[in-house]
């Protein structure tokens, strides 16, 4: 498994990973405690045919071509977690691991 | 996590699992000796925002709305393998358990 | 629907070869082995090998190894199946048969649609 | 190679018995046993796969069972297009291999 990893300055136009701050103080998100932000990252591109599928499933509906297919699109094949602290609804702070926050990398599915 | 199931006949626009069935007989692929067809089901439709979206990265993504990230497109969020019989490379008969050949749902990311 | 069509009988001496025929229709000849099957006058049945036409695999009874040859024509959809130095003893009809997999193991098959069988007599 | 031996040889029965067939494998073949039914003739055309799975369009009057070495097929209650020569086949491993036949006739 391998992606395209991209910043502001590519000219690349095909799915790729780009750099992405997520700021929760910027959203007015106060119930986060930490971090106030993190690297999440994100994928954007064009997902041309076999260019980084993910799964072999995405090559046999192409080739079976149903009516309504969108064909793949550029999408996260690969996620972590981060901790965080928080408060919850019942104001009790959490401190937990919070899953597939981080995209570590994109493909075509 | 849930996603919706839809048919041939559901007026359902919003992302949605439908029944394929891949024949490999069909495409040719003849070093596939067993099976010759499976129930594969691809996902097709529209991704409003929060709607099914399968992980909060998706939904930060939209907020903090980045240059060139396109909106959550709808694909797979749950897939599973089958058993298949088949020749390598180097015509040995291989019995395997092949990842993420059927869509058990779909879903927004 | 899945048909085998095998070629005519035969007269062959001892020490000859022959060369019978199981035409395929109905089906992606392609992909399914075809097996040989054969059997002697009064007798039971005796498994010769197989051959997947896809790529031309083959897998033949001990028995038999140093004298059959199975191949494929996929222009055609033809199994051949050549017995060489030929006895009395391998006169007997021979059958082609299309192994059907049910499942995805490899013994997960049966033998679905059979020739209609062809009869190679072996005399002098 | 796997021996096949099948029971009995030739067997006489009268339309509407119910009769049995077995076969003994030299060893454990996972239940990969087929029965097959042979007029004069004509070619083996296969009833059941499996040990105990019916071949689609094969009436249910025919049935088998049995596991590890030790199968029998059973026809509940004979007609006269019954009246044939049954075989077993392993196919557990290769060579394929046959029991000798047994010959079904009427009484």
């Known amino acids: 498994d391998f992606g395209l990893d991209c910043d502001e300055h590519s000219t690349e136009s095909r799915c790729c990973r780009y750099p992405l701050t997520v700021d929760f103080e910027a959203f007015g998100w106060d119930w986060i405690i930490a971090p106030k932000r993190y690297k999440a990252n994100y994928c954007s591109g064009e997902c041309e045919f076999v260019f980084l599928q993910k799964y072999p499933h995405t090559h046999l509906v192409h080739q079976a071509n149903p009516r309504g297919s969108a064909g793949p699109c550029c999408t996260p094949t690969k996620m972590s977690p981060i901790n965080m602290l928080y408060f919850n609804g019942k104001e009790q702070i959490i401190y937990g691991k919070i899953p597939a926050m981080v995209v570590d990398r994109c493909g075509c599915s | 996590d849930f996603g919706l199931d839809c048919d041939e006949h559901s007026t359902e626009s919003r992302c949605c699992r439908y029944p394929l069935t891949v024949d490999f007989e069909a495409f040719g692929w003849d070093w596939i000796i067993a099976p010759k067809r499976y129930k594969a089901n691809y996902c097709s439709g529209e991704c409003e925002f929060v709607f099914l979206q399968k992980y909060p990265h998706t939904h930060l993504v939209h907020q903090a709305n980045p240059r060139g990230s396109a909106g959550p497109c709808c694909t797979p969020t749950k897939m599973s393998p089958i058993n298949m019989l088949y020749f390598n490379g180097k015509e040995q008969i291989i019995y395997g358990k092949i990842p993420a050949m059927v869509v058990d749902r779909c879903g927004c990311s | 629907q899945v048909q085998l069509v095998q070629s005519g009988a035969e007269v062959k001496k001892p020490g000859a070869s022959v060369k019978v025929s199981c035409k395929a229709s109905?089906?992606?000849?392609?992909?399914?082995?075809m097996h040989w099957v054969r059997q002697a006058p009064g007798q039971g049945l005796e498994w010769m090998g197989n051959?997947?036409?896809?790529?031309?695999?083959?897998n033949y009874n001990q028995r038999f190894k140093a004298r059959v040859t199975m191949t494929t024509d996929t222009s055609t959809s033809t199994a051949y199946m050549e017995l060489r130095s030929l006895r009395s003893d391998d006169t007997a009809v021979y059958y082609c048969a299309r192994r059907y997999y049910y499942g995805t193991g490899f013994a997960d098959w049966y033998f679905d649609v059979w020739g209609q069988g062809t009869l190679v007599t072996v005399s002098s | 190679d796997i021996q096949m031996t099948q029971s009995p040889s030739s067997l006489s029965a009268s339309v509407g018995d119910r009769v049995t067939i077995t076969c003994k494998a030299s060893q454990d073949i996972n239940s990969y046993l087929s029965w097959f039914q042979q007029k004069p003739g004509k070619a083996p055309k296969s009833l059941i796969y499996r040990a105990n799975r019916l071949v689609d369009g094969v009436p249910s009057k025919f049935s088998g069972s049995g596991s590890g070495t030790d199968y029998t097929l059973t026809i509940s209650s004979l007609q006269p297009e019954d009246f044939a020569t049954y075989y077993c086949l392993q196919s557990d491993e290769f060579p394929l291999t046959f029991g000798q036949g047994t010959k079904l006739e009427i009484k």
């Open positions: 109905g089906y992606s000849f392609t992909g399914y082995f």
């Open positions: 051959i997947y036409p896809y790529n031309g695999v083959s």
